[in-house]
């Protein structure tokens, strides 16, 4: 039986029934959030022998292993994944071990096994037997290996039953529990899987199999399955489906969507069968299976049943992700926020049309709308009172509309109203009447001269750079020294740089008020010789990257009682030189003859430059005859020393631990000082933690259905 | 205190182009205002031609606006008015004015054309 | 356009007396955000014109305060308290809702 479109097993252990007769999961399993350790022994569930999705297990109670659950899983497809990994075990508070002595493949995806305070048998499970990479893999904050003593079946009789693997230059045994070994298939079979008596398996056959060299005995599908048998591509009127099966047309057409029942219905495109058309395509039609390219952004339209959507946070903008038309007005109310231009982006940065008015008012956050990155027509079916369909008023911070060099907005109908935005130059107004086409409709009462930009340096002239010097992570720059009309008004420069791939930032790019800025900022004081130019060397920047830098200059002179006076540069991108690349990450090798090496890794995260080559050392080494790093002649005599809590602090260290030379003398020695690189690596991983967690929250923390 | 000093030719010939000048003093032409020109045949009403922002932006009359174009020069912190295809019609008293939110609060001294051949 | 109506055409007044001009408009002055947009300007003979009054009622600077202006919408008037011989001249009207701005034909206030 094929059991779908996920199971969520959550608060009563009893749900487990529910896999009672699955042989697939299509989908995901969840198993979580049972607080009450109960006994699971009586729960058996040996025909599962393949998940699609990921297996997801969060504080389970009273769970001890996996093996005696799932005794037959084999293959954990990943055809989607929880945040990058296909199978997580996280604050189980009770796993001794994961015991899935039949799981032999994790097709896509990686695994998290993190804050298991019991778990043990996690370093002698050779996971490079059953994933493609290990190197996303994530480990951390389980029992010590140390405090588990594990031991593999036979090693205490010193008749040792498991096969021996090298992982991390460690040989050792490699099994899932105390009496289970991890399955090895003869190195004949190559990369194929085999049956239990080490036979090879058919190339289209995935973990194991029943019968040798038989496409119809496989437990689980290499590619495709589809009427009893093992295929490397769905023939011809069949579609693929959940990325490991074949359908028919009416199969896929019969398909109810677990997301909504008023859905569509999935459709057939590029030969898979699939809830909804892929980024960049949309339905041929209302009622169409079949998919074509859209022109530009797919539309997506959003609909707001109280004609108007209030916009006052990151979660309402959240509603509008994805969104291209929106059918009602835009009120946008951001008085605070936290990166809220980048967030705002985000969610509203694919609206390209607005069927009623936009009115933005009292968003203090506010720096820019250039987070409506495609608005490009608000259409004014309904307008505020006195017919407008773009109203701004009291934004304080406001100072940027849209670039207009790169954008076309149309307004159809209605006019634009501007009162009260103390930073926004009129002139800028008075440019996108012109664009959007509003010119003449607005009365002089609806752009107010007075009390628009009267806090901004509306007037601004243009500061030029007069040379750029640049190394492998440092730019000198100079300007022209600015002579505002009352030198004395003149106060310092600030310098603004970011990194900038392409050449298409502007000022206002990821800015808010409250704070959130994508350029970094420096102060330049004015060079005490009237005769030297101004500038600035910035360092501790990265090799062979391109950045934006502009320069604003810091004035007081007024115009008039009622404006200042400013200058800035333009906008000057310059690249930093080459420098020597990072070191290639993920190197592996593996024997593959008595006399060949096979060695693969990837590029370096830094390449600091254009690659050309790579230079590939290598040395003979003395064979280590040290393979054994514990001797344990008992298990009941592995010292135990702390229960493992299953946080992920670093242990403490009681004294100082004797070290070889140091200092040129003998005797105990402190551990070195981190380095920053290394300190900067501990903060990175906890932020990560961190950001995994939130996710999981996120996902299966939901409210309980009415 | 702004003032406003215009200057231009006092005599055009028909279907020429009248040319004027307004300097502003004072203060700034890039100051949140708007620069107009007002014309009064003799004896008669003013009439508004059109106007200018420093940025460039305008407003014309559509009665004329096929024949005006004003500019603005913001080095020498002046706006000029060029009015194509003069006839009779177009002798007048010409002046630039400046206009806040709060009204036409500056004026010129006003310049008089005289379209004749 | 806006087509603005002016009257009397012309006013003769006493010296110390008060006198009132009033000003119609084809459509409504008054703007969403309260404010009357007509303003009143005086030109003296042989002079450039001056601005008296602003957004319907508000004295420019410098201005006496025996003008005063009022009315909205479509009705306005300027009134002088107690006319002095300083205050002879035309007076204009002129609405400043929309381009083009337009002015009203003109009254020509002289001293009996």
């Known amino acids: 039986e094929i059991c779908g479109p996920g199971i969520d097993i959550r608060n009563d252990y009893q749900q487990l029934k529910r896999l009672e007769n699955c042989t697939v999961i299509e989908g995901y399993l969840h198993i979580l959030l049972i607080s009450k350790a109960e006994d699971y022994r009586s729960y058996r569930f040996p025909k599962l022998t393949v998940i699609t999705e990921y297996l997801l297990l969060f504080r389970v109670a009273g769970l001890e292993s996996l093996g005696d659950l799932f005794p037959n899983l084999t293959v954990i497809r990943g055809w989607k994944l929880f945040y990058n990994y296909a199978l997580v075990i996280f604050e189980m508070t009770n796993l001794k071990d994961i015991g899935l002595y039949n799981l032999r493949n994790i097709t896509r995806g990686a695994i998290r096994i993190e804050k298991n305070a019991d778990l043990c048998y996690l370093s002698t499970v050779d996971w490079s037997l059953i994933l493609d990479a290990v190197s996303n893999n994530y480990i951390v904050g389980n029992k010590p290996p140390k405090e588990c003593g594990d031991l593999c079946p036979g090693t205490m009789e010193e008749k040792p039953m498991c096969e021996k693997t090298t992982i991390n230059n460690e040989y050792n045994y490699r099994c899932w529990t105390t009496n289970r070994c991890q399955k090895m298939c003869p190195s004949t079979c190559g990369k194929r899987a085999c049956t239990e008596n080490n036979e090879c398996c058919h190339p289209e056959c995935l973990g194991s199999c029943s019968a040798p060299d038989n496409d119809t005995a496989c437990v689980a599908c290499r590619h495709y399955y589809y009427a009893g048998v093992c295929v490397p591509a769905c023939p011809p009127n069949t579609y693929r489906f959940e990325g490991w099966r074949c359908v028919d047309r009416d199969f896929c057409a019969n398909i109810l969507s677990a997301e909504s029942s008023d859905s569509e219905g999935f459709v057939i495109h590029d030969g898979e069968c699939m809830q909804e058309c892929p980024s960049g395509f949309i339905r041929n039609g209302s009622q169409s299976m079949y998919c074509i390219p859209c022109e530009g952004p797919c539309p997506k339209v959003c609909e707001e049943e109280k004609k108007t959507k209030t916009i006052d946070s990151v979660t309402s903008a959240q509603m509008l992700q994805g969104c291209t038309i929106f059918k009602g007005n835009l009120l946008i109310n951001i008085r605070r926020g936290n990166n809220i231009a980048s967030e705002l982006e985000n969610f509203m940065g694919l609206i390209e049309v607005v069927t009623g008015y936009v009115k933005i008012r009292h968003s203090h956050a506010l720096v820019s709308l250039s987070f409506l990155k495609n608005l490009r027509l608000i259409l004014g079916e309904e307008q505020l009172e006195g017919n407008y369909s773009f109203y701004v008023l009291d934004n304080q911070n406001l100072q940027q509309l849209w670039d207009w060099d790169h954008r076309n907005l149309t307004i159809k109908a209605g006019k634009m109203y501007f009162a009260f935005n103390p930073k926004l130059c009129v002139s800028e107004i008075y440019r996108m009447e012109e664009v959007t086409g509003t010119k003449g409709r607005q009365s002089k009462g609806d752009i107010n001269t007075r009390n628009n930009g009267e806090r901004a340096s509306c007037e601004s002239d243009v500061l030029h750079f007069t040379s750029t010097t640049t190394s492998k992570n440092r730019i000198i720059i100079t300007w022209h020294r600015y002579r505002p009309p009352d030198y004395r008004d003149l106060i310092s420069f600030t310098v603004y740089y970011k990194e900038a791939p392409f050449k298409n930032v502007t000022e206002y790019d990821g800015q808010d008020a409250c704070g959130s800025n994508s350029w970094n900022m420096v102060d330049v004081d004015l060079p005490p010789n009237k005769d030297v130019e101004p500038g600035i060397l910035l360092h501790g920047l990265k090799p062979w990257t391109q950045y934006a830098v502009y320069v604003k200059a810091v004035t007081l002179t007024m115009v008039e009682n009622d404006h200042i006076r400013g200058a800035k540069s333009e906008i000057l991108y310059i690249r930093t030189n080459a420098s020597v690349p990072s070191i290639p990450l993920d190197v592996l090798s593996a024997s593959n003859s008595s006399s060949q090496l096979i060695v693969k890794w990837n590029p370096p995260s830094l390449p600091n430059g254009n690659l050309s080559y790579y230079i590939v050392r290598w040395q003979r080494q003395p064979q280590d005859g040290y393979l054994y790093r514990h001797n344990y002649c008992s298990k009941d005599k592995i010292p135990i020393r702390k229960y493992a809590d299953g946080t992920i602090d670093i242990e403490e260290v009681t004294e100082n631990p004797k070290t070889e030379v140091c200092g040129g003398e003998k005797g105990p020695c402190c551990a070195c000082p981190k380095t920053e690189a290394e300190k900067q690596a501990e903060k990175e991983e906890a932020e990560y933690r961190k950001v995994f967690e939130n996710f999981l929250h996120n996902s299966i923390f939901v409210p309980r259905p009415e | 205190q702004v003032q406003l000093q215009q200057w231009g030719p006092g005599l055009v010939k028909p279907s020429g182009t009248l040319s004027l000048t307004c300097a502003v003093s004072?203060?700034?032409?890039?100051?949140?205002?708007?620069w107009s020109w007002v014309r009064q045949p003799p004896g008669k009403g003013l009439e508004w031609i059109g106007e200018i922002y420093h940025s460039g932006s305008t407003n014309y009359n559509p009665s004329l606006e096929s024949r005006v174009t004003i500019s603005v020069d913001k080095s020498k912190n002046q706006f000029s008015l060029k009015l194509s295809s003069v006839t009779a019609a177009d002798t007048a008293v010409y002046y630039c004015?400046?206009?806040?939110?709060?009204?036409?609060?500056?004026w010129g001294q006003g310049t008089t054309v005289t379209v004749s051949s | 356009d806006v087509v603005m109506t002016q009257s009397p055409l012309s006013l003769p007044v006493t010296p110390g007396e008060p006198a009132s001009i009033s000003c119609r408009s084809s459509?409504?002055?008054?703007?969403?955000?309260?404010?009357?947009?007509l303003d009143w300007y005086l030109q003296k003979p042989g002079q450039s014109p001056q601005l008296l009054i602003y957004?319907?009622?508000n004295r420019a600077s410098g201005v006496p305060d025996r003008f005063s202006g009022s009315g909205s919408g479509t009705d306005f008037t300027l009134k002088i308290s107690r006319v002095e011989a300083e205050d002879v001249g035309v007076y204009y009207c002129?609405?400043?809702?929309?381009?083009?701005?337009?002015f009203g034909g003109g009254t020509k206030v002289e001293i009996k």
């Open positions: 957004l319907g009622s």
């Open positions: 459509q409504s002055l008054l703007h969403s955000n309260g404010y009357n947009y």
């Open positions: 004015a400046r206009d806040r939110y709060y009204g036409m609060d500056v």
């Open positions: 004072g203060g700034s032409i890039s100051s949140s205002n708007w």
């Open positions: 002129m609405q400043a809702l929309q381009t083009p701005l337009t």
